[in-house]
């Protein structure tokens, strides 16, 4: 007979996992806010900037109360994957004017990637059903001009900021229900 079975492996406290996810999200939120401000200083541009390929904002702050944990995490993960893809596209196709923000965009991409891994871990810790693999997304067309790249960057950072703000509020609210 083999060695006696060890003590059952205790899953880490999901509240602690959620805490570290909140911290990561909040840090990314502040850095995104700052990077967007930096971009606006470098390239002043009036008005709101939109990009049709970006996800629509998941939820208004007022509707947070009705949220359930699986739905929040699944939707947040899907939206952040889209933003990760857009940041990668921006770094690749954004044009020479955005090269000055390359270190910051690279850091942003790495942190987004880290947050997505953290969400994945949280979902498995909570024994939530894993979402199916993402279908391949259609490629994003390169910006039509240097100014188009800047406007796209402003739209991506603005949308990511709103999504992360929503995420922090949602995660903190859900923590109270665990």
């Amino acid at each position: 007979p083999g060695p006696p079975p060890g003590p059952p492996r205790v899953s880490p406290d999901p509240r602690a996992e959620l805490d570290s996810t909140v911290l990561l999200t909040r840090s990314l939120l502040a850095d995104t806010r700052q990077l967007a401000a930096q971009l606006r200083d470098k390239f002043p541009a009036d008005g709101d900037h939109n990009l049709d390929s970006l996800p629509t904002l998941a939820m208004s702050a007022g509707a947070l109360g009705a949220l359930q944990l699986p739905g929040v995490l699944t939707r947040l993960r899907a939206d952040l994957l889209s933003y990760l893809r857009h940041v990668q596209w921006l770094r690749r196709a954004g044009g020479s004017s955005l090269k000055t923000l390359e270190p910051e965009l690279g850091t942003l991409q790495a942190r987004l990637d880290r947050l997505l891994r953290r969400l994945q871990l949280l979902m498995s810790r909570l024994a939530l059903p894993q979402p199916p693999p993402d279908p391949p997304a259609p490629p994003l067309a390169p910006p039509s001009s240097a100014w188009g790249g800047i406007r796209a960057a402003l739209a991506i950072l603005g949308g990511l900021h709103l999504t992360l703000d929503w995420a922090v509020r949602g995660l903190l609210l859900l923590k109270t229900r665990l």
Epitope: S27, A30, A37, D41
Partner: antibody
Framework: EVQLVESGGGLVQPGGSLRLSCAAS????????MHWVRQAPGKGLEWVAY????????YYADTVKGRFTISRDNAKNSLYLQMNSLRAEDTAVYYC?????????????WGQGTLVTVSS | EIVLTQSPATLSLSPGERATLSCSVS???????LHWYQQKPGQAPRLLIY???NLASGIPARFSGSGSGTDFTLTISSLEPEDFAVYYC?????????FGQGTKLEIK
């Protein structure tokens, strides 16, 4: 040596206006975000407003939103706070402050402050 | 808005003693966004510690900071007469940026 010198404070009636200035020297003013922070007599510190180096992003505390306007003139190394519709509760010493080297490192340099008194 | 609550409101100690000041944050914040300031009567505040544990320029090594999440601490290992002042914590992760109400460190 970094220096920040506020001016423009004084006595003003409720509903009145005042414009504070902050003259900066000893650093590249156009490279740093700047803040206004105030302190009512005998009370704690209250953040008022922030402006990025290029003036394209501005944040305000809810207590002053719509009444105060922060601005800067990088050519003159100056920061401003235009205060309108002043209330008794705006009475405070107003400090201008510079962020450290990065936005997330706190308010590293402060002026000596200028006193604003709102009273009839 | 993120609320910072400092305790105790007043701390009475003697020179040479160790001082421990607390700052409790209403919501989880990353430690790199928590800073400490010292203010003496009639003077502007002075940055002591930034990003929870980094000493600002010119600050003596008897000052140290620690903490994470919602609980942060400023420690003065051995009080000097010039350390008696008001101390404020501040968060910079969320707009509006907010300060604690202050802890007054007075001579016993």
């Amino acid at each position: 040596e970094v220096q920040l010198v506020e001016s423009g404070g004084g006595l003003v009636q409720p509903g009145g206006s005042l414009r504070l200035s902050c003259a900066a020297s000893g650093f590249t003013f156009s490279s740093f975000g700047m803040h206004w922070v105030r302190q009512a007599p005998g009370k704690g510190l209250e953040w008022v407003a922030y402006i990025t180096p290029g003036s394209n992003t501005i944040y305000y505390a809810d207590t002053v939103k719509g009444r105060f306007t922060i601005s800067r003139d990088n050519a003159k190394n100056s920061l401003y706070l235009q205060m309108n519709s002043l209330r008794a509760e705006d009475t405070a010493v107003y400090y201008c402050a510079r962020e450290y080297y990065s936005y997330d490192e706190g308010f590293a340099y402060w002026g000596q402050g200028t006193l604003v008194t709102v009273s009839s | 808005e993120i609320v910072l609550t400092q305790s105790p409101a007043t701390l009475s100690l003697s020179p040479g003693e160790r001082a421990t000041l607390s700052c409790s944050v209403s919501s989880l914040i990353p430690s790199k966004y928590l800073h400490w300031y010292q203010q003496k009567p009639g003077q502007a505040p002075r940055l002591l510690i930034y990003r929870t544990s980094n000493l600002a320029s010119g600050i003596p090594a008897r000052f140290s900071g620690s903490g994470s999440g919602t609980d942060f601490t400023l420690t003065i290992s051995s009080l000097e007469p010039e350390d008696f002042a008001v101390y404020y914590c501040q968060q910079g992760v969320d707009v509006p940026f907010t300060f604690g109400q202050g802890t007054k460190l007075e001579i016993k």
